[in-house]
């Protein structure tokens, strides 16, 4: 059980206050994290409170600055890059978001030798992205979708491809199912080790459906965007691999790196691109139907100037029962002799491990073992492996840091953070420095979040780079909920929940529950961590009993939980849902008779689904930007756990799992529907459909929707929301405004 | 204020060698990293070589192959083996830190002059 330790006194009752939703709107409560950007094995960046950026050198204790707010805010920068030579900055101005990941910006490069910014062949505006090489002060960058190439700064560019079109071909930078789906960056190309190759992705979308949607702004006239966007089934991109040589581009120019013959069959996916030295690469693919992805390592031919990707060097990862991969397929991590790799898959037992790979798949050495999850592989030196796991004392949503120490036989495991702050820290990500001589850790809970520099030979903590004691000192006088962590055991199914009580919590009176749900495939909602948000303030202020289950298809307890739910979603998540429902009412405090649930994107289809279950559980729900039909969401994720909306595949079932075909269901209970009509991602085009089989079916519910907003409704529509949202619960529950 | 002495310019031919020593009058210069600036008359200052605390080192690509920065920790003093010299490296010579402290006084540099 994880309680937050009340700080409530009798004779200090009177001194504390409960949340305000003003609080959760303002931010009052937020934390702050300390991310170092390493530039050597002892040395880190940061941007000040002030804006000056400084070195910092954990060696000597000392910090100086090297570029003064005075020069970011002559071009209004938000954003800094050092290059490897230390000899340039690049200050980005003008962000423009684009979608997740993506955003165009201006650039500027100041020269810290002479203390100006370079003159001469500027950079054009706005750029799609920009990047320096890993070693001396190259430049990528991509504009208009092509590729350019500066050896330095102030020398004129190189153009590396010239068919780069709007919405059409993308070069070095993904489109919109590839940003999102696949490759979760705003770029798509890499830099070997030493700058010698620039390896790239582009993306064909001529034939790809578009999805086109108003915005409505403020002219006469709203814009209509268009976006090429693969639907389930629908025409995908066409990706090619390409590397160019960057001290010689015009010798032979890009060559094209090929895609191994069993997935060129039919159509594919390329998924990630990992340099092993300058002149090895490795390549993952992967196939439509995505239980099957390929790893090639391929090698520079010197003498022909190609890349030669043999059999022999391809590995296959394949998955029986689901599909391959957790959200992503993992990528490997290269050992020293730069051909062996640590890479993180399945077991026998359906964990993901970690596995050790010399020469086959079929050969691999398995690091790790046992009926948790190993989650992420940080760093692997000459002597140690480190990674996460959610090990420790058997709670899932735990993460804390292990070491494995590799240079010894056999090899010994030591988890550094599972007892530094054990009330405090269970959920850790680590952050390392060069050849991880120095790490931070960066705990997010369940307590205050608090981020340290620690010692990566002796794990001794050196010292802490963010305790947020502003925040821990406005909290003083707030009551907050408690919070507990536990599980049900329900069918042989381990349903693991996360329940936010009122902070005079008493088990004999009777409290409304609102259930909070994602369920996503691979997600997880029950996690150990620190958040002062919406639910915080409704158990706080309101008196709601707030519950988040984790239920089948959520991650890291198996590929039984994980893969329960393949080519059938929205069956057993909201089973889940409801089977802990019933549990929570068993336990004696939950006023039956007034139960919601809420969710967005995909809760926001497992709330719909549970409200149009039948059970009669809940009093009302609201769903935030559903998706309604697998039809209409992006290919890449809806078919990697659905397949393909075809007769002869799986298309009863997209067609039986949409939120429109129970629309007669929603007759009683209290329906509120959200969408930002500029949705990119979850298109509108969803709860237009869910609205229309309602008002068809003659079913009365409300609704609102925001203009011009994307799937996060963000800036003043979030205050909007979350009061809207909050009037529709209190109303439902009958308690007072 | 730590103050950095350069020295060791001088006048060469082409294709002869020369050595820069930098010394810090603080230990800082030991554990942090250091570099190599020079600036050609009428010409920018630019970067040369650089040296991080544990010796990894860099250098701008018109000088690799030709020249080697190195440090002596015990001593407090950052080198500069210059081989192969060219006109083009004429210039005056700097020591600072990698990269530079921003705001502080460059020194007084030492003069390097390639010429036959």
């Known amino acids: 059980i994880v309680l937050r330790p009340s700080r409530v006194h009798n004779s200090e009752e009177n001194t504390m206050r409960a949340l305000t939703l003003k609080d959760i709107l303002n931010g009052t409560f937020s934390y702050k994290t300390f991310f170092p950007n390493w530039i050597s094995g002892q040395e880190y960046l940061h941007q000040s409170a002030d804006n000056n950026i400084v070195l910092y050198n954990i060696e000597t204790g000392q910090s100086y600055t090297i570029l003064s707010n005075r020069t970011m805010k002559s071009v209004n920068a938000s954003n800094y890059g050092l290059s490897p030579d230390r000899q340039f900055v690049y200050l980005e101005s003008d962000y423009s978001k684009l979608w997740r990941y993506s955003y165009t910006a201006t650039y500027y490069i100041y020269d810290l030798s002479n203390g100006e910014f370079v003159r001469g062949n500027e950079l054009p505006r706005p750029i799609q992205y920009l990047c320096w090489s890993p070693v001396g002060s190259k430049l990528a960058y991509v504009y208009q979708n092509n590729i350019y190439l500066k050896q330095r700064p102030g020398d004129p560019p190189f153009q590396i491809t010239f068919n780069g079109r709007e919405n059409k071909i993308f070069n070095g930078i993904p489109d919109w199912v590839y940003e999102e789906e696949m490759l979760a960056t705003k770029y798509a190309l890499w830099w070997s080790p030493n700058g010698k190759f620039l390896a790239y992705a582009e993306f064909n979308d001529t034939d790809i459906p578009v999805i086109a949607y108003s915005y409505y702004g403020d002219e006469q006239y709203p814009r209509t965007i268009n976006i090429p966007y693969p639907k389930a089934g629908a025409k995908n991109p066409v990706v090619r691999i390409f590397i160019i040589d960057t001290t010689y581009p015009a010798y032979v120019g890009p060559q094209e790196v090929p895609v191994p013959a069993m997935i060129a069959s039919s159509d594919y996916y390329f998924s990630w691109l990992t340099w092993v030295t300058d002149e090895r690469v490795c390549l993952q693919w992967l196939k439509r139907v995505q239980n099957v992805s390929v790893l090639s390592i391929c090698d520079f031919r010197e003498d022909w100037q190609t890349w030669d990707c043999p059999k022999t060097q391809e590995h296959i990862e394949e998955s029986r029962t689901g599909w391959a991969g957790g959200f992503f397929v993992s990528t490997p991590v290269f050992s020293y002799d730069a051909i062996s790799y640590y890479k993180i898959f399945s077991d026998k037992d359906g964990y993901k491990h970690i596995h050790y790979i010399k020469d086959t798949v079929e050969n691999a050495i398995q690091i790790t073992s046992g009926k948790w999850e190993a989650i992420n592989i940080f760093r692997v030196t000459q002597d140690s492996l480190f990674y996460s796991s959610n090990e420790f004392e058997e709670y899932p949503g735990r993460r804390n840091i292990y070491r494995i120490s590799i240079g010894s036989y056999p090899p010994s495991k030591k988890c550094v953070t599972c007892h530094l702050r054990k009330e405090r820290c269970q959920y850790y990500t680590a952050s390392f420095s060069d050849y991880a001589k120095y790490y931070a850790l960066v705990c997010y809970g369940p307590g205050i979040p608090i981020s340290t520099l620690h010692d990566g030979r002796t794990d001794q903590e050196i010292k802490i780079l963010e305790e947020n004691k502003e925040l821990e000192n406005a909290l003083k006088n707030i009551q907050l909920p408690k919070e507990e962590i536990k599980k049900l055991e329900v069918d042989e199914i381990t349903l693991w929940y996360k329940m936010i009580l009122p902070p005079q919590f008493d088990r004999s009176k009777k409290y409304p529950l609102l259930i909070q749900v994602y369920g996503g495939p691979c997600s997880q909602s029950v996690r150990s961590v620190f958040a002062v948000n919406w639910i915080s303030y409704l158990a706080s202020k309101e008196g709601m009993v707030i519950a988040l289950v984790d239920g089948r298809g959520t991650a890291f307890q198996g590929d039984k939980l994980l893969y329960a739910v393949y080519r059938k979603l929205g069956v057993y998540e909201v089973e889940d849902q409801i089977t802990a429902v019933r549990k929570f009412i068993e336990m004696g405090f939950i006023d039956e008779k007034r139960i919601a649930i809420w969710g967005w994107s995909y809760g926001g289809y497992v709330s719909s689904l549970a409200l149009a279950s039948g059970t009669g559980l809940f009093k009302c729900g609201i769903a935030v930007a559903p998706v309604s039909s697998w039809e209409y969401y992006a290919s890449v994720y809806t078919e990697r756990f659905m397949g393909l909306p075809t007769k002869d595949d799986n298309l009863e079932h997209y067609k039986n799992s949409t939120v429109m075909a129970r629309a007669e269901y929603f007759r009683n209970v209290d329906y509120l529907l959200i969408h930002g009509t500029a949705d990119d991602n979850v298109h509108f085009q969803n709860s237009a459909q869910i609205a229309k089989a309602l008002v068809n079916a003659q079913v009365d519910f409300q609704a609102m929707w925001y203009s011009d907003q994307n799937h996060g409704l963000s800036g003043l529509s979030t205050n909007h929301l979350y009061t809207h949202m909050t009037h529709f619960l209190k109303q439902c529950f009958s308690l007072s405004d | 204020q730590v103050q950095l002495q350069e020295s060791g310019g001088g006048l060469v031919q082409p294709g002869e060698s020369l050595r820069l020593s930098c010394a810090a009058s603080?230990?800082?210069?030991?554990?942090?990293?250091m570099g190599w600036y020079r600036q050609a008359p009428g010409k920018e200052r630019e970067w040369v070589a650089g040296?991080?605390?544990?010796?990894?080192?860099n250098y701008a690509d018109s000088v690799k192959g030709r020249f080697t920065i190195s440090r002596d920790n015990a001593k407090n003093t950052v080198g500069l083996q210059m081989n192969s010299l060219k006109p083009d490296d004429t210039a005056v010579y700097y020591c600072?830190?990698?990269?530079?402290?921003?705001?502080?006084?460059w020194g007084q540099g030492t003069q390097v002059t390639v010429s036959s």
């Open positions: 040296i991080t605390s544990d010796g990894i080192t």
């Open positions: 603080g230990s800082i210069s030991s554990r942090n990293a």
């Open positions: 600072n830190f990698w990269p530079p402290l921003y705001g502080r006084p």
